[in-house]
């Protein structure tokens, strides 16, 4: 996705993005909370594609691992947190049934706040 | 994805999420920047599935439409911005070729900062 740094901006939370194949992912959590096996190949007409996912998570090596950038520390505690979204993937469930299911993948790193009670 | 509010937390940026059908989406931008038509249905072994996408964007009606929550305003200007990610979708390109391509969809609302130059 577009890079804020190119516009002279900073992100409140530092993130890293990478492409992950199903072969590396192996399993995922579906919408009902069950663990499913992510299939390596997606059939296309008389062939197959590798199943890939674009994943974004908070950068564990980044400046913001201790808290979000730019926060008013007098009033707030902050934390960068990886959030998830749903994408459709070809999967196999525990009963060996193959089908397209929505699975959770990491898609963003956002800042969450808690108010400072005692000052 | 998990709701920070449930843990007594606030998001720096307010977002809204919704399921969007290909019929509503109609077109999208692929990884090479070209516009493709998103097909309404995906063929599966026993019929067809409606093509759906889980999209998250900044809430235009939210408190944070004027800037991010909890920012140190003495030092920073802030803005909540919708970011995008890639998901594979069955699409048709300008040459009428049907295939699975990665398209951009809205997946998050993050806060970007610019430093205040003059105080």
């Amino acid at each position: 996705h577009s890079d804020p740094a190119r516009r002279g901006e900073l992100s409140v939370c530092d993130s890293i993005s990478e492409w992950v194949t199903a072969a590396d992912k192996k399993t995922a959590v579906d919408m009902s909370g069950g663990t499913v096996t992510v299939l390596e190949k997606v059939p296309v007409s008389k062939g197959q594609l590798k199943q890939y996912f674009y994943e974004t998570k908070c950068n564990p090596m980044g400046y913001t691992k201790e808290g979000c950038r730019g926060i008013d520390k007098r009033h707030w505690n902050s934390q960068c947190r990886t959030t998830q979204s749903y994408v459709r993937a070809l999967t196999m469930d525990s009963k060996k049934r193959i089908g397209w299911r929505f699975i959770r993948i990491d898609t963003s790193c956002v800042c969450t706040l808690t108010i400072k009670r005692g000052r | 994805h998990s709701d920070p509010a449930r843990r007594g937390e606030l998001s720096v940026c307010d977002s809204i999420s919704e399921w969007v059908t290909a019929a509503d989406k109609k077109t999208a931008v692929d990884m090479s920047g070209g516009t493709v038509t998103v097909l309404e249905k995906v063929p599966v072994s026993k019929g067809q599935l409606k093509q759906y996408f889980y999209e998250t964007k900044c809430n235009p009606m939210g408190y944070t439409k004027e800037g991010c929550r909890g920012i140190d305003k003495r030092h920073w200007n802030s803005q909540c911005r919708t970011t995008q990610s890639y998901v594979r979708a069955l699409t048709m390109d300008s040459k009428k070729r049907i295939g699975w391509r990665f398209i951009r969809i809205d997946t998050s609302c993050v806060c970007t900062l610019t430093i205040k130059r003059g105080r």
């Epitope: 990478e18 072969a23 590396d24 296309v44 008389k46 062939g47 | -």
Partner: antibody, heavy 118, light 108 residues
């Protein structure tokens, strides 16, 4: 700039072993599957082996299965090909190549020559 | 395994002429075909992917077409730097990923 630099080629006798390395730079190494493609002298291109970004998916051509082992060290941004029980027909330039999401090859190294001769 | 057959084996042409290279697949591969150029002593270079999309930095004189089993690479007006060997590769059905035998475009 994307760079792929192979090393480890040389002259060996049939039945011997060799380990090729490929140092990658200029891109997020873990995001890309990597492959080895070879070219015998005066011949065409032959795909040898491929490995997914984190090493969970590994694939070989039938001609090398059981003899060659592909691996990667993501902490060093390096791809390897361990070649055992080498044969005369393995003589070739071995190219390290980066794979795109759709499994074609967008960047190639300059290659390293492996000669198997008695 | 999908077999790719390239023809002709050698194409002898003069600079400025049009070159038409063919790649035939043993079974349908949708549009999942790439073309590479290789000059003597150099590594191959990606020219075309998805049968007709030019890779970054590739001049407009290179044009790919076709789908299914029949594919064509056309070089509209040969420049001196275009004399090389051209390979096609399919990525519809894998492993293995397979290449054609190559077409050599030489100066007449």
């Amino acid at each position: 700039d994307v760079q792929l630099v192979e090393s480890g080629g040389g002259v060996v006798r049939p039945g011997e072993s060799l380990r090729l390395s490929c140092a990658a730079s200029g891109f997020t190494f873990t995001s890309y599957a990597m492959n080895w493609v070879r070219q015998a002298p005066g011949e065409g291109l032959e795909w040898v082996s491929g490995i997914s970004g984190r090493g969970g998916g590994i694939y070989y051509a039938d001609s090398v299965k059981g003899r060659f082992t592909i691996s990667r060290d993501n902490s060093k941004n390096t791809l390897y090909l361990q070649m055992n029980s080498l044969r005369a027909e393995d003589t070739a330039i071995y190219y390290c190549v980066r794979e795109t999401l759709n499994i074609f090859f967008d960047y190639w190294g300059l290659g390293t020559l492996v000669t198997v001769s008695s | 395994e999908i077999v790719l057959t390239q023809s002709p084996g050698t194409l002898s042409l003069s600079p400025g002429e049009r070159a038409t290279l063919s790649c035939r697949a043993s079974q349908a591969i949708n549009y999942y075909l790439a073309w590479y150029q290789q000059k003597p002593g150099q590594a191959p270079r990606l020219l075309i992917y998805d049968a007709s999309t030019r890779a970054a930095g590739i001049p407009a004189r290179f044009r790919g077409s076709g789908s299914g089993t029949e594919f064509t690479l056309t070089i509209s007006s040969l420049q001196s730097e275009d004399f090389a060997v051209y390979y096609c590769q399919q990525y519809n059905n894998w492993p293995p990923l397979t290449f054609g035998g190559g077409t050599k475009v030489e100066i007449k």
